[in-house]
């Protein structure tokens, strides 16, 4: 167990050019206040995805007032330390990510408006009970320069805090195998308490209350040797001497999280994705409720009906996520079709349209052929962003502009002789064959086969085809 | 043609977790956000929430915030609804939808999930 | 929230019959209202969008108007296959809300 702390020095404009105006003026006077939260591991999630390791408000800092024409100063903080209590391990890895936020105290209906200011996040490695870490994180134009450290709480001490200490029994030394406390030398490390029952020659443990076996024995308390019959989907490795081993109790088994935490097995241990409203190791620290203001942007903070909801933030209009803190980006429902730009004008959303397309949502294809006209009676075929026109008989070209022997095509059928006529083409058709296109053969006995030629054409006449 | 096509009933008890798939077909997955709706016995619908399929980020109503959880995998064109410590009142069936920057234009047809002791 | 009310919540009506039903909003939403389908089975099916436009592949007996809070849809020549609950939706502002029905059944 043990407490991150965070330290807020200073909180104003950043260097460079385009520092940011006062969040705070005469007509709408503000105080600000910052929160952070952790997470274990080199995670990059989402901002509003679970503080698994745990979450801070500062208190309000002073009330401040723009003076005008004065550049934006830093701004007065609150008092005191961010502390984020932890009751399991300290990770050595984590993320964090805090905030800056404003609290306006002009004439608000329903109470202060909150705005979140700035927003700086990172992934650090830390060992506990190290000295205070400086750093300094930009957001846009504004800088935050804070220091940090994790310490235990006693008894446990250590790079982790998961080692415990004692008074010494014997004012000279430690019993057999334990080392002095560094660095409180006159204390000295306790045997960790591992869980009652645990095998002493085929178990240990690495936290109090767990029982993890050696190669070879299984069960809660690695009592069981490792059956070298059969298995199916061994957990641990197989060997010549000893076969394969039979699954042992995983780290997930029996779900170590608490407070509908569930769990994951991960190579080393296990993990617990908690409820909001929970946090820790095994989701057993029940972490913040309405009393801590936990909703932003004028969110209602509605306290859970079971634990694991220990709270719920109804949003007002235009803002979403657990604690009202991201402000709604309607684009993020899709609604332009067609690859168009959505734009969340705040009161509207707009589609700006790709060429070729139309409408609200860009959900028209448009008429390519709008405006264009096809020559010599061509017609205008739409086709995904160009058009084209299917030509009149005698011509062609993109627009029909272009006279076109009709005959080119060859289109008289079985060796029959092609002429071009002011009206399209005709087919003088050879013998035996009949038809625009000489397409149908001529029975013997003077038959044709379907369409019959029309009355006054004999077959192998001449057709014209109209 | 355009189809969501979702799991199977569930039978369940509190305090377990159900997850419910919607598999899409017939159009680009990634192109249209979608929507989870749930329909108590004998009662209305009841918008939950949507999720980007563009980027995976899900947006919730607020009497679905905490045990509830959208995702997708993207490439079996599939949205998830997840729900958590299961309680009674979850009892219902779940529909996904599809938004065309209109309305939900097309459905699934339905997951029931029953939670009892 | 946006509140939908359908007042009426069972309809009888005869094949044949114009039939009518009305959803109110508790505020303005831009014409962004949307009438759905559900049949006895459970499938739903998007009818109306945008106040009146009719969705594709949906007969052209039914339509939909109004404006401001107050909207409609009409089915002009009832048919067996028209018995389902009906729905309006607004999809103005998050979050999304449905009025409570209409069963819509034969006499």
């Known amino acids: 167990a043990g407490v991150f702390e965070l330290q807020i020095h200073s909180f104003g404009p950043g260097p460079g050019p385009g520092a940011p105006r006062s969040p705070c003026s005469a007509r709408l006077p503000c105080r600000l206040f910052f929160r952070v939260c952790l997470k274990p591991g080199l995670s990059e999630e989402a901002a509003e995805s679970p503080c698994a390791l745990g979450a801070a408000l500062s208190a309000r800092g002073p009330v401040y007032t723009e003076q005008p024409g004065a550049p934006a100063p830093d701004l007065p903080l609150p008092d005191g330390l961010l502390q984020v209590p932890f009751r399991d391990a300290w990770p050595g890895t984590f993320s964090f990510i805090i905030e800056t936020w404003r609290e306006e105290l002009g004439d608000q209906i329903g109470g202060p408006a909150w705005s979140l200011l700035a927003r700086v996040a990172g992934r650090r490695r830390l060992a506990a009970g190290g000295p205070w870490a400086r750093d300094i994180q930009r957001a846009g134009a504004w800088e935050l320069r804070f220091s940090y450290r994790a310490r235990c709480e006693p008894p446990a001490v250590g790079t982790a805090c998961t080692r415990l200490c004692r008074p010494r029994s014997a004012p000279s030394r430690c019993g057999p195998g334990l080392r002095p406390c560094a660095p409180l030398e006159d204390e000295c490390e306790a045997p960790l308490v591992c869980r009652a029952g645990c095998s002493p020659e085929h178990g240990f443990c690495e936290q109090p209350g767990e029982c993890r076996c050696l190669e070879g024995w299984t069960g809660p308390l690695c009592t069981v040797p490792v059956s070298t019959s059969s298995c199916l989907s061994p957990r641990g490795p197989s060997s010549a001497t000893t076969g394969c081993l039979v699954p042992g109790p995983g780290p997930c088994d029996g779900n170590p999280c608490a407070n509908g935490g569930s769990c994951s097995e991960t190579p080393r241990s296990f993990e617990c994705t908690c409820p909001r409203g929970f946090y820790g190791l095994r989701c057993e620290v029940s972490g913040v409720t309405c009393a801590d203001g936990p909703c932003f942007n004028g969110g209602l903070c509605v306290g859970g009906a079971d634990p694991d909801s220990a709270y719920i933030c109804h949003c007002p209009p235009g803002f979403q996520g657990s604690n009202c803190e991201k402000r709604v980006d309607r684009c993020s429902l899709q609604p332009c079709r067609n690859g168009g730009l959505c734009l969340d004008l705040g009161h509207a959303l707009r589609c700006r349209c790709r060429a070729g397309f139309a409408g609200p949502r860009c959900e028209h294809d448009l008429d390519d052929c709008a405006g264009r006209a096809c020559a010599n009676g061509g017609t205008c075929v739409e086709g995904g962003g160009a058009h084209r026109c299917s030509c009149a008989l005698g011509f062609g070209g993109r627009d029909c502009r272009e006279r076109a022997d009709p005959c080119a095509a060859r289109p008289c059928a079985h060796g029959g002789r092609c002429y071009a006529h002011f009206s399209g083409l005709v087919c003088a058709c050879a013998p035996g064959y009949m038809g625009a296109r000489c397409e149908f053969p001529v029975h013997p006995d003077g038959a044709s086969a379907l369409p019959a030629a029309p009355p006054g054409l004999r077959p192998g006449d001449p057709q014209r085809y109209l | 043609q355009i189809q969501l096509v979702q799991s199977g009933p569930e039978l369940k008890k509190p305090g377990e977790t159900v997850k419910i798939s919607c598999k899409a077909s017939?159009?680009?997955?990634?192109?249209?956000?979608m929507h989870w709706v749930k329909q108590a016995p004998g009662k209305g619908l009841k918008w939950m929430g949507w999720?980007?399929?563009?980027?995976?980020?899900?947006g919730y109503a607020d009497d679905f915030k905490g045990r509830f959880a959208f995702s997708l995998e993207t490439s079996a064109s599939t949205a998830y609804l997840q729900i958590n410590n299961l309680k009674n009142e979850d009892t219902a069936t779940y529909f996904c939808?599809?938004?065309?920057?209109?309305?939900?234009?097309?459905w699934g047809q339905g997951t029931s999930v029953t939670v009892s002791s | 929230d946006i509140q939908m009310t359908q007042t009426t919540s069972s309809l009888s009506a005869s094949l044949g019959d114009r039939v009518t039903i009305s959803c109110r909003a508790s505020?303005?939403?831009?014409?962004?209202l949307h009438w759905y389908q559900q049949k006895p089975d459970g499938t739903v099916k998007l009818l109306i969008y945008?106040?009146?436009r009719l969705h594709s592949g949906v007969p052209s007996r039914f339509s939909g108007s109004g404006s401001g809070t107050d909207y409609s849809l009409t089915i002009s020549n009832l048919e067996l296959e028209d018995i389902a609950t009906y729905f309006c939706?607004?999809?103005?502002?998050?979050?999304?809300?449905f009025g409570g029905g209409t069963k819509l059944e034969i006499k």
């Open positions: 939808a599809r938004y065309d920057g209109y309305a939900m234009d097309y």
């Open positions: 017939g159009y680009t997955f990634t192109d249209y956000s």
């Open positions: 999720i980007n399929t563009e980027t995976g980020e899900p």
């Open positions: 505020q303005d939403h831009s014409n962004h």
């Open positions: 945008y106040t009146s």
């Open positions: 939706q607004q999809g103005d502002m998050l979050p999304w809300t």
